[in-house]
Interface confidence: medium
C-alpha cells in the first residue's frame, strides 16, 4: 500500500486557522517522504496516486518543510500550516520512494481554505400582530464563517425561556406559544462571531384582554 | 379536566435504578413541558429538570446531570423519570409539574421513592 | 444560580391579621417590565398549589385575600385577613433563567 494523507482538523480551515496535513506511509516499505504544493490551478485528479509524470516532475517544485515522525511501523510527515490564507489553497502531494524499486509514489490532496465571512441573517421576523392564546413562529437564520451563533433578546434584554417561550435548532427557531399580554415588546435576533455581529428586529404587538392566563 | 397522574410509591435498593411515570390528560400536553421537582422529607423543593413533550428535548438542573433520565412517551402522554444508582440521598418524594409560563400551574400527587437495602 | 432566601422561615400570625413573607433574590429576576418570580402554597401531604405568577398576578380560583408585590430581587407575599385553612408552607420560585431555584420555604401558623 502507497503513501496516505490526512487532514488535522478532518475539515476545511477557514482563513487564520491552522491545519496540518499528515503523509503516512509504511517505513519498512518506504523513504525519503516529501511534501510538495502543485500550485493554485488544481489538478484533474484530486485525490489518489497520481500519474508517473507528475510525480516525476515534482523535482521542479519547491519542497515544503515538515516535520518527520515515526512510531514503530510508520513514518509521519506533518506539514502544518499555521495561519492558513486563501493562498494556501491547492494540491498538496507527498511524495514516497520504494526503498528497494526506488519507484516514486505520490498521493494528492486538495485543500481548499474557506473565506472568513461576517454574519448575516435571513428569515421571517418582522413585526406582526397576534391575538391572546395564539401562536408566534418565527425563523431567523444566520449565515457566516465561522458559523455565527444565535442568540434572542426582547426589550434589549436576553430571552427567557419557558414552556411558552421556545427556541430550537440552535436557537433558529422562535414559538411564542400561548401568547400573553407580556410577550408584547421589540424581539431581536443577534447571530455573532469573531467577525463581528448581525441583527434583526421585530415588535410583536399582543391584542385581546388577558384571560384567565393559567387555564387551558 | 387538566390532571398529572403519578405512579405509586417506590422501595429501591441502592444502586438499582428508579422509573417514575406521570400521565397527563386533559390538554394539549405536546404544548407544553412537563417538570419534575424533588421534595426531601421535612424539606424544600428542588428543580429537577424539564422535557418538552413535542421533541423530547430536556433541560436538566447540573445537579442532577448523570442522576435523573427524562423521557416522554407521546402515545400515552406519559412523561418518564429514571434516578440511576440512587442513594438514600435520593430518598424524596418527586413531583411532576405541567409548567404554564414558567410557573407551575398543575401538579401530579408525588410519588415516594425509598432508597433502602 | 439564583438563590432565593425567603423570610421570616416561620411566622404565627392570629386569625383576621396579615401575613407578610418575604423572597430575596441574589440577582434581578425582572425583565422587560416584568418580574418572573411565582408562589406557591403547600399544605402536608399535598403537591405545592400555584397562588401567584409574574411577581403579582392572581392564579384562578386562589382567593383575592393572597396579594404579590415586588421587583428586581425584593418580593412579598401578602395574605390578608388570614384564615384557618392558610395555615401551610409558602415557597416563592423563579423563572428567569435555568436552573429555576425554590426559595427555602416560609411556614405560617395561625393563632
Known amino acids: 500500500r502507497g503513501p496516505e494523507i490526512t487532514l488535522q482538523p478532518d475539515m476545511q480551515p477557514t482563513e487564520q486557522e491552522s491545519v496540518s496535513l499528515w503523509c503516512t506511509a509504511d517505513r519498512s516499505t518506504f523513504e525519503n517522504l516529501t511534501w510538495y504544493k502543485l500550485g493554485p490551478q488544481p489538478l484533474p485528479i484530486h485525490v489518489g496516486e497520481l500519474p508517473t509524470p507528475v510525480c516525476k516532475n515534482l523535482d521542479t517544485l519547491w519542497k515544503l518543510n515538515a516535520t518527520m515522525f515515526s512510531n514503530s511501523t510508520n513514518d509521519i510527515l506533518i506539514m502544518e500550516l499555521k495561519n492558513a490564507s486563501l493562498q494556501d489553497q491547492g494540491d498538496y502531494v507527498c511524495l514516497a520512494q520504494d526503498r528497494k524499486t526506488k519507484k516514486r509514489h505520490c498521493v494528492v490532496r486538495q485543500l481548499t481554505v474557506l473565506e472568513r465571512v461576517a454574519p448575516t441573517i435571513t428569515g421571517n421576523l418582522e413585526n406582526q400582530t397576534t391575538s391572546i392564546g395564539e401562536s408566534i413562529e418565527v425563523s431567523c437564520t444566520a449565515s457566516g464563517n465561522p458559523p455565527p451563533q444565535i442568540m434572542w433578546f426582547k426589550d434589549n434584554e436576553t430571552l427567557v425561556e419557558d414552556s411558552g417561550i421556545v427556541l430550537k435548532d440552535g436557537n433558529r427557531n422562535l414559538t411564542i406559544r400561548r401568547v400573553r399580554k407580556e410577550d408584547e415588546g421589540l424581539y431581536t435576533c443577534q447571530a455573532c462571531s469573531v467577525l463581528g455581529c448581525a441583527k434583526v428586529e421585530a415588535f410583536f404587538i399582543i391584542e385581546g384582554a388577558q384571560e384567565k392566563t393559567n387555564l387551558e | 379536566e387538566v390532571q398529572l397522574q403519578q405512579s405509586g410509591p417506590q422501595l429501591v435498593r441502592p444502586g438499582a435504578s428508579a422509573k417514575i411515570s406521570c400521565k397527563a390528560s386533559?390538554?394539549?400536553?405536546?404544548?407544553?413541558?412537563m417538570h419534575w421537582v424533588k421534595q426531601r422529607p421535612g424539606q424544600g423543593l428542588e428543580w429537577i429538570g424539564m422535557i418538552d413533550f413535542s421533541d423530547s428535548e430536556t433541560k436538566l438542573n447540573q445537579r442532577f446531570k448523570g442522576k435523573a433520565t427524562l423521557t416522554v412517551d407521546k402515545s400515552s402522554s406519559t412523561a418518564y423519570m429514571q434516578l440511576s444508582s440512587p442513594t438514600s440521598e435520593d430518598s424524596a418524594v418527586y413531583y411532576c409539574?405541567?409548567?404554564?409560563?414558567?410557573?407551575?400551574?398543575?401538579w401530579g400527587a408525588g410519588t415516594t421513592v425509598t432508597v433502602s437495602s | 444560580d439564583i438563590v432565593l432566601t425567603q423570610s421570616p422561615a416561620s411566622l404565627a400570625v392570629s386569625l383576621g391579621q396579615r401575613a407578610t413573607i418575604s423572597c430575596r433574590a441574589s440577582?434581578?429576576?425582572?425583565?422587560?417590565?416584568?418580574?418572573?418570580m411565582h408562589w406557591y402554597q403547600q399544605k402536608p401531604g399535598q403537591p405545592p398549589k400555584l397562588l401567584i405568577y409574574?411577581?403579582?398576578n392572581l392564579e384562578s380560583g386562589v382567593p383575592a385575600r393572597f396579594s404579590g408585590s415586588g421587583s428586581g430581587t425584593d418580593f412579598t407575599l401578602n395574605i390578608h385577613p388570614v384564615e384557618e385553612e392558610d395555615a401551610a408552607t409558602y415557597y416563592c420560585q423563579h423563572s428567569r433563567e435555568l436552573p429555576w431555584t425554590f426559595g427555602g420555604g416560609t411556614k405560617l401558623e395561625i393563632k
Open positions: 409539574a405541567r409548567d404554564v409560563r414558567g410557573n407551575f400551574d398543575v
Open positions: 440577582k434581578s429576576v425582572s425583565t422587560s417590565g416584568y418580574s418572573y
Open positions: 409574574l411577581a403579582s
Open positions: 386533559g390538554y394539549a400536553f405536546t404544548t407544553y413541558w
